[in-house]
């Protein structure tokens, strides 16, 4: 009971409010399928409270189960474009440390120009998340069309 | 430490459990692209705990970062219908106060009949969220096909 | 105030951290449209903390408002396949107890090969959630393409 009481008296931050919502900064150079993200109040409605950006990739600072969500809209896209350039695929995964590398979330565009999904997944301090967009189409940089975020849910 | 202890002794409600899940009430009159929402246990599985409805639009009562989510399915829709009536677009945004007006989330239907997405965004007490459906197709009123909600995540 | 203080001194688990993320185990026998799920660290990144599996269906252990989310990708699928086999529909609902049976979330694939959505809904202890996939196409078992989860949000 003592422990529980002490635990409750920690600042709420210590209960784990880690959260981030990012906007697209740019795509990678040729042969690099990764999307590069940015965040911060100066940029609009994106933010990082806990997680950090490491060369445009999201690095986790607190162990726990996270809700990961993403929406990517292709620029200058119609269903004709999307099907002509098929396959265009988005994958979100842990890309470092290499020992923990895994794909968490994968979607193809088929005849659509937007994908959006979310999932719960355990993440550990130091995990870096990468979002790989494969294909020849480019993502929209509009902040209401393309975004990526995580929310700490429980230990 | 005193402050943290006092803070922990507030009812849990004060930690910010604001949440709402709404079902479609009706579309707007001509030239008004907004969807009008309703919520409450008498209507089924929709509810408002904290946020309120103001003429069918959702008004926020507590500052914080929110997870906003939406699904809209078009009535009497097939991929042929959707492409024939293209563009049909859904946008979720802050529509008042005017000084904070911004689009938060935008999706087009292309050859699909349902859009679904979610994002994290800072909202302030008094922000009213509007959901604009542009195009000639109409949203389904089935409660498992069309819904809109917010969940307070952190201060 | 006494009650609030005592309440705060309960272990955090008692605040309701119930959460589950499941991966597809198998589809049902003919005439059974249900998807059968599995979860646990031995299987990869799926887990159950609170809810339980009952013959592959998810059973809730704590009353509250939950965020329910799902992604299902069809195996060996292209937009041509999807439209040729239309309608293929996914519905998530409470399937038992029978008195609470209701559809919570419904999406059709149309010309796409993946559906993904989420919603907030009240669930009660003992509610069992079923995910029905109707049509002739089969879901992918890849853990980054097909998954289903719930997260307790508030009482």
């Amino acid at each position: 009971q003592r422990f529980a009481q002490a635990q409750q008296q920690l600042p709420l931050e210590s209960l784990g409010w880690d959260v981030a919502e990012l906007q697209l900064n740019h795509t990678g150079p040729q042969q690099d399928p990764r999307l590069y993200w940015q965040g911060g109040p100066a940029l609009g409605r994106s933010f990082l409270h806990g997680p950090e950006l490491d060369k445009g990739q999201l690095r986790i600072h607190r162990d726990g189960i996270y809700m990961v969500h993403i929406q990517v809209t292709l620029a200058i896209c119609s269903s004709t474009t999307a099907s002509r350039h098929h396959p265009t695929t988005l994958a979100v995964g842990i890309c470092s440390p290499a020992s923990r590398s895994i794909s968490l979330l994968r979607l193809s565009f088929h005849q659509g120009c937007t994908i959006a999904s979310q999932r719960l997944t355990p993440l550990a301090r130091g995990d870096t998340l990468c979002t790989n967009l494969t294909g020849t189409l480019l993502p929209s940089r509009n902040t209401d069309e393309t975004f990526f975020g995580v929310q700490w849910v429980r230990p | 430490q005193r402050f943290a202890q006092a803070q922990q002794q507030l009812p849990l409600e004060s930690l910010g459990w604001d949440v709402a899940e709404l079902q479609l009430n009706h579309t707007g009159p001509q030239q008004d692209p907004r969807l009008y929402w309703q919520g409450g246990p008498a209507l089924g599985r929709s509810f408002l705990h904290g946020p309120e409805l103001d003429k069918g639009q959702l008004r926020i009562h507590r500052d914080g970062i929110y997870m906003v989510h939406i699904q809209v399915t078009l009535a009497i829709c097939s991929s042929t219908t959707a492409s024939r009536h293209h563009p049909t677009t859904l946008a979720v945004g802050i529509c008042s106060p005017a000084s904070r007006s911004i689009s938060l989330l935008r999706l087009s239907f292309h050859q699909g009949c349902t859009i679904a997405s979610q994002r994290l965004t800072p909202l302030a007490r008094g922000d009213t969220l509007c959901t604009n459906l542009t195009g000639t197709l109409l949203p389904s009123r089935n409660t498992d096909e069309t819904f809109f909600g917010v969940q307070w995540v952190r201060p | 105030q006494r009650f609030a203080q005592a309440q705060q001194q309960l272990p955090l688990e008692s605040l309701g951290w119930d959460v589950a993320e499941l991966q597809l185990n198998h589809t049902g026998p003919q005439q059974d449209p249900r998807l059968y799920w599995q979860g646990g660290p031995a299987l990869g990144r799926s887990f159950l903390h609170g809810p339980e599996l009952d013959k592959g269906q998810l059973r809730i252990h704590r009353d509250g408002i939950y965020m329910v989310h799902i992604q299902v990708t069809l195996a060996i699928c292209s937009s041509t396949t999807a439209s040729r086999h239309h309608p293929t529909t996914l519905a998530v609902g409470i399937c038992s107890p029978a008195s609470r049976s209701i559809s919570l979330l419904r999406l059709s694939f149309h010309q796409g090969c993946t559906i993904a959505s989420q919603r907030l809904t009240p669930l009660a202890r003992g509610d069992t959630l079923c995910t029905n996939l109707t049509g002739t196409l089969l879901p992918s078992r890849n853990t980054d393409e097909t998954f289903f989860g719930v997260q307790w949000v508030r009482p």
Epitope: - | L24, H26, T27, P29, Q30, A75, T136, L138 | -
Partner: nanobody
Framework: QVQLQESGGGLVQAGGSLRLSCAAS????????MAWHRQAPGKQRELVAI???????NVDDSVEGRFTISRDNAKNMVYLQMNSLKPEDTAVYYC???????WGQGTQVTVSS
């Protein structure tokens, strides 16, 4: 109490046509999205056609090219024009204020082969 009243149903041979009408008191039709549903024996009620306030209508794929929905806001009326009728179109047809639980009594349409 607002009433919706359908008319125009009947018995028709396959390939024939019918025009269903829906009338209401007040301005209920003029001010709302309207729909036609149908229910065949032993089947669930299904949405067949829908029309927005501005007059843009949409019909289900199963009746595309054969049925059209229209409205006359001045007369507070909504119509369903049904051409090239098939036996599988046999059902009770209901007029509905789509976003409200407001229904007519229905009109029987029987298509004989």
């Amino acid at each position: 109490q607002v009433q919706l009243q359908e008319s125009g149903g009947g018995l028709v041979q396959a390939g024939g046509s019918l025009r269903l009408s829906c009338a209401a008191s007040g301005s209920i039709i003029r001010d709302n999205v309207m729909a036609w549903h149908r229910q065949a024996p032993g089947k669930q009620r299904e949405l067949v056609a829908i029309i927005n306030i501005g007059g843009s209508g949409n019909v289900d794929d199963s009746v595309e090219g054969r049925f059209t929905i229209s409205r006359d806001n001045a007369k507070n009326m909504v119509y369903l024009q049904m051409n090239s009728l098939k036996p599988e179109d046999t059902a009770v047809y209901y007029c509905n204020v789509y976003y409200r639980d407001l229904w007519g009594q229905g009109t029987q349409v029987t298509v004989s082969s």
